[in-house]
């Protein structure tokens, strides 16, 4: 799987999950999030050569088309597959609120 | 929506579905499909500027991060959203078989 276990331990040029730390205040200008100060959102990048981790029948066909016709510009793209939530603490007035934001952390990627 | 109705009628540089006709024999080297001879598989391409059809909370955050940090290389990617099946006719020996292949035609795209 093109997941953090594999991708963070290997120098992989092709589609893989990459580490990306986002500081809420510095990178997004968000003052409203109290905790955490930031988090590893991660992101997917890298070419999808040949038939790498094809997601659907379409991406299999497109991957095959691209493999057999290398001059073609239509190739699958490396995007998130498994995502995990992030729990944040913020305040509404003086009232603390704990919220779980879904699909915030990329754990693995696929070619779609 | 970044669908065929919109994208095929507009010169859209950003993420959109693009027409791609695949000839089974010429492009894939498939002799086994009797009908159709090919089909519009289509594909997704184009940049994903901030908030363009963001798919998840992660792609929204990543889009914002990318907008506020233009030097960053981490941006969402334009990939299929809605896919439709394709019905094909082929033969097993002399017996005709009709098969519906799922997720073969891209109808719309998203930034993921």
């Amino acid at each position: 799987a093109l997941d953090t276990n594999y991708c963070f331990r290997n120098l992989e040029e092709n589609c893989c999950v990459r580490p990306l730390y986002i500081d809420f205040r510095q990178d997004l200008g968000w003052k409203w999030v109290h905790e955490p100060k930031g988090y590893y959102a991660n992101f997917c990048s890298g070419p999808c050569p040949y038939l790498r981790s094809a997601d659907t029948t379409h991406s299999t066909v497109l991957g095959l088309y691209n493999t057999l016709n290398p001059e073609a510009s239509a190739s699958p793209c490396c995007v998130p597959q498994d995502l995990e939530p992030l729990t944040i603490l913020y305040y509404v007035g003086r009232t603390p609120k704990v919220e779980q934001l879904s699909n915030m952390v990329v754990k693995s990627c696929k070619c779609s | 929506a970044l669908d065929t109705n919109y994208c095929f009628r507009n010169l859209e540089e950003n993420c959109c579905v693009r027409p791609l006709y695949i000839d089974f024999r010429q492009d894939l080297g498939w002799k086994w499909v009797h009908e159709p001879k090919g089909y519009y598989a289509n594909f997704c391409s184009g940049p994903c500027p901030y908030l363009r059809s963001a798919d998840t909370t992660h792609s929204t955050v990543l889009g914002l991060y990318n907008t506020l940090n233009p030097e960053a290389s981490a941006s969402p990617c334009c990939v299929p959203q809605d896919l439709e099946p394709l019905t094909i006719l082929y033969y097993v020996g002399r017996t005709p078989k009709v098969e519906q292949l799922s997720n073969m035609v891209v109808k719309s795209c998203k930034c993921s």
Epitope: L51, T57, T60, V61, L64, L68 | L28, G29, W30, K31, W32, Y90, V92, K97, E99, L101, S102
Partner: nanobody, 114 residues
Framework: QVQLVESGGGLVQPGESLRLSCTAS????????MGWFRQAPGKQRDMVAI??????SYADSVKGRFTISRDNAKNTLALQMNSLKPEDTAVYFC?????????WGPGTQVTVSS
């Protein structure tokens, strides 16, 4: 259900040749492609060569050295590997994609070492 079995792996010296074979059994129809993939320790499984009814494609690293061939009548797939290099060392897998579904063999080890 499709079953695949590879054979022909082994230990060879750099510059030597090997021929891998794969036999497919079961109901073989609607073949998108057949191919050879390889996986080195701790790495992803990567394409070596694929074959459709009348098209072939090779990974850049094996072009001019490896040749894929299919015998549809016998449901077999072969990979002739010449001028082998230490970096070709991997487990080699036969793959058949039928109507969008992947089937894999258990793999055969190829080791190139002096």
């Amino acid at each position: 259900q499709v079953q695949l079995v590879e054979s022909g792996g082994g230990l060879v010296q750099p510059g030597e040749s090997l021929r891998l074979s794969c036999t497919a059994s079961g109901s073989i129809f609607g073949v998108f492609y057949m191919g050879w993939f390889r996986q080195a320790p701790g790495k992803q499984r990567d394409m070596v060569a694929i074959s459709t009814d009348d098209r072939t494609s090779y990974a850049d690293s094996v072009k001019g050295r490896f040749t894929i061939s299919r015998d549809n009548a016998k449901n077999t797939l072969a990979l002739q590997m010449n001028s082998l290099k230490p970096e070709d060392t991997a487990v080699y897998f036969c793959n058949l994609n039928q109507l969008g579904t992947d089937y894999w063999g258990p793999g055969t080890q190829v080791t190139v070492s002096s």
